[in-house]
């Protein structure tokens, strides 16, 4: 069985989000992929790849870069210079038609907060890359890590309902801590 779990990524303004979405090679290698933000009940397509996809041929739309690796079945998404208003729920989709998109796994809940009162613009080029989750719980490990080096997920009771045309997906969160390297 496949679990649909939402990952929560927390960033400071100016940092860069880098995530990936995997897909079935045999089905979608030549399909267009898109990165969308859920706004109310309707998703908003922010960027989409060309068709047919070409290896290592990035598509840039403003602060968003998509790079499809059809040989590997992976789409890389990069969002630079994050702003508070970028906060929200995002997902990768196989873009077939504006009203007909197949949602890929691992929806992303992005939370962007104002940077700490440091040197203006000091975090502009920094990247937070979610690394991995320790096997211990957030409660036990939390105090050892300070923002922005930790990402904690919402409590297990919370469920986000994502509505996409013709489908409804329940995404259940898991409580954990994710360590991240912070690049300046």
């Amino acid at each position: 069985t496949t679990e649909l779990t939402e990952e929560k990524y927390e960033y400071k303004e100016g940092q860069t989000l880098e995530v990936k979405c995997d897909y079935a090679l045999e089905k979608y290698a030549n399909s267009r992929k898109a990165w969308q933000k859920m706004e109310g009940k309707m998703p908003k397509i922010l960027a989409k790849t060309e068709r047919p996809s070409e290896n290592s041929h990035p598509v840039q739309v403003g602060r968003i870069t998509l790079e499809d690796y059809p040989d590997h079945g992976l789409l890389q998404v990069r969002m630079t210079n994050l702003q508070v208003e970028d906060s929200g729920l995002y997902q990768c989709v196989i873009y077939q038609h504006p009203k007909e998109s197949h949602v890929l796994f691992n929806p992303i809940c992005l939370v962007v907060t104002k940077g700490s009162s440091g040197t203006p613009g000091s975090s502009e080029n920094s990247t937070q890359n979610v690394y991995r989750t320790p096997s211990t719980t957030a409660k036990a490990l939390g105090p050892r890590y300070t923002s922005p080096r930790t990402v904690t997920q919402a409590p297990p009771e919370s469920t986000v309902v994502v509505s996409t045309p013709g489908s409804e997906i329940n995404l259940t969160n898991v409580t954990d801590i994710i360590r991240v390297p912070v690049f300046n």
Epitope: T5, D22, Q76, F105, N106, V130, Y131, S135
Partner: antibody
């Protein structure tokens, strides 16, 4: 504790196939990618490909495409890597390694299996 | 594919010496670089990820620096247990590629 345990050494003939297993324990199996890396005797490390145990999707490096198959059994938290049409130059130690969480573009392999020696000889 | 060139391929140093290994990428890889240690007959061990973030439990004598195409891995004071081969690995673009390795020995 978090660990990956691989199946034992294999000796096989050219043209045959080998299937190596990698059992994960101590963490949420479906949240992290599993990667396969091989190392010929006295040589460096070579990435073969990845698998997302949750979606079941996988991908491999061009040179292995068509010869490598990655599968998983979530009920026993095990990933399998099968390499077919074996040649003598496939003789190597094959490692499974845990990558980052599946949604992250972060490919650091923090947990490794002990390795499985595969010898291809006629 | 991105080529990772490590140098030197081997080195010999005394206990307490400062050891430096370099890794050069054939194109800009941002900070997308990891360092591993592999002892004979064992699986590799992650030491540094994201160019300079030390993995939990790894001694502070190990450090990493650099960005773009040029990276450095340093052992500030070589210990007998550091005898191993060290590898860099890039993850900026697929396929993931490793450097050829640097074998560190004690004089």
């Amino acid at each position: 504790q978090v660990q990956l345990v691989q199946s034992g050494a294999e000796v096989t003939k050219p043209g045959a196939s080998v299937k190596v297993s990698c059992k994960a324990s101590g963490y949420t199996f479906t949240r992290y990618d599993i990667n396969w890396v091989r190392q010929a005797t006295g040589q460096g490390l070579e990435w073969m490909g990845w698998m997302n145990p949750n979606s079941g999707n996988s991908g491999s490096v061009q040179k292995f495409r068509g010869r490598v198959t990655m599968t998983r059994d979530t009920s026993i938290t095990t990933v399998y890597m099968e390499l077919s049409s074996l040649r003598s130059d496939d003789t190597a130690v094959y490692y499974c390694a845990r990558g980052g969480i599946s949604s992250s573009w972060h490919w650091a392999f923090d947990i490794w299996g002990q390795g499985t020696m595969v010898t291809v000889s006629s | 594919d991105i080529q990772m060139t490590q140098s030197p391929s081997s080195l010999s140093a005394s206990v307490g010496d400062r050891v430096t290994i370099t890794c050069q990428a054939s194109q800009d890889i941002n900070n997308h670089l990891n360092w591993y240690q592999q002892k004979p007959g064992k699986a590799p061990k992650l030491l540094i990820y994201g160019a300079y973030t030390l993995e939990t439990g790894v001694p502070s004598r190990f450090s990493g620096s650099g960005s773009g195409t040029d990276f450095t891995f340093t052992i500030s004071s070589l210990q007998p247990e550091d005898i191993a081969t060290y590898y860099c690995q890039q993850y900026d673009k697929l396929p993931l590629t490793f450097g050829g390795g640097t074998k560190v020995e004690i004089k």
